[in-house]
């Protein structure tokens, strides 16, 4: 009896959908695996007789409720199928946006770049897919614990009237208000402000 794959899960970030599993202990030799997806009542092979422990399902529609399955094989024997269900638009992880930060005196000027949809030729982004897409920005004085959050209206934001000659750290994530779903935070970007440019009267 061939044991089934273990810890079967979908690792999906920005619609790059990788089904992953672990090979079970099997004394007779090396196992291979076949992974399939359900397409209008018929299971279709996606990865056949692979020695890998993952399979790329990124071509699946972003909007479908998909049934995927994987089994282990050895010679003419095979395990039972292990099934999972997956809806990319609901289940994919929203990766961190890109961010450009520029210091202008006592202000930080930020521009945000929505994560690109993985594996497509053209420059569609997660913002295209999700109508309610917005950004959360978190910033703080470097070395302190108190963090401030804002929700920019656009793909850019300016933090004004900051303390001069002070290092501020900023990070951004995508947020979907209609789904109450937050993406991953970007790595913090820390920049030092310069002088206050206001002219005394």
């Amino acid at each position: 009896m061939v044991p089934p794959p273990e810890n079967v899960r979908m690792n999906s970030v920005n619609f790059k959908n990788i089904l992953q599993w672990e090979s079970p202990a099997f004394a007779k030799g090396n196992l291979t695996f076949t992974a399939q997806y359900l397409s209008y009542r018929i299971f279709q092979d996606k990865c056949m007789n692979t020695t890998l422990t993952e399979c790329d399902f990124s071509s699946l529609s972003k909007y479908g409720d998909h049934t995927l399955r994987v089994r282990a094989e050895f010679a003419d024997e095979h395990s039972d199928w292990v099934n999972i269900t997956f809806c990319p638009v609901d289940d994919t992880i929203i990766g961190p946006p890109g961010m450009q930060v520029e210091v202008l005196a006592d202000s930080l000027h930020m521009r945000f770049l929505a994560p690109k949809i993985e594996n497509e030729y053209e420059t569609w982004t997660m913002k295209n897919v999700y109508n309610s897409w917005t950004y959360n920005v978190q910033y703080w004085k470097n070395g302190t614990d108190e963090k401030f959050q804002i929700t920019p209206q656009y793909d850019f934001e300016v933090l004004r009237n900051l303390e001069p000659w002070t290092t501020y750290c900023v990070q951004v994530r995508g947020f979907l208000p209609d789904r109450n779903k937050a993406g991953e935070w970007s790595e913090p970007v820390c920049e030092q402000t310069t002088h206050d440019e206001t002219v005394p009267s």
Epitope: Q44, S61, K62, Y63, N119, Y121, N128, V129
Partner: nanobody
Framework: QVQLQESGGGSVQAGGSLRLSCAAS????????MGWFRQAPGKGREGVAA???????RYADSVKGRFTISKDNAKNTLYLQMNSLKPEDTAMYYC????????????????????WGQGTQVTVSS
């Protein structure tokens, strides 16, 4: 909300022609991969032809040289020109779309398209 509406089906004699149309609404049409599928009674739904947002096309072997897929971005309409029709082309024909898609995956399977029309019937008699 994305909506697809097929038209142009009907009955025709073997060797004849039909042109199917799929009017799309509710999205930026040029950003979609689209396809025509068909389903004969008692059979599965199979891919007939597909066109990516960059205009590249693919056909099932059974229709190559007889069917032509095209799209008119200005009219938000997808077409399937079917020539030299055969009785085995008899089926319900469905239009499908997948948004924010390029040619990266060469989509041809039902599970690779997220939005579907209601279908239009094509009947070819011998």
């Amino acid at each position: 909300q994305v909506q697809l509406q097929e038209s142009g089906g009907g009955s025709v004699q073997a060797g004849g022609s039909l042109r199917l149309s799929c009017a799309a609404s509710g999205y930026t049409y040029s950003s979609y991969c689209m396809g025509w599928f068909r389903q004969a009674p008692g059979k599965g739904r199979e891919g007939v032809a597909a066109i990516d947002s960059d205009g590249s096309t693919r056909y099932a072997d059974s229709v190559k040289g007889r069917f032509t897929i095209s799209k008119d971005n200005a009219k938000n309409t997808l077409y399937l020109q079917m020539n030299s029709l055969k009785p085995e082309d008899t089926a319900m024909y469905y239009c499908a779309a997948e948004p924010y898609c390029s040619g990266g995956y060469k989509r041809t399977m039902v599970a690779e398209f997220g939005y579907w029309g209601q279908g239009t019937q094509v009947t070819v008699s011998s």
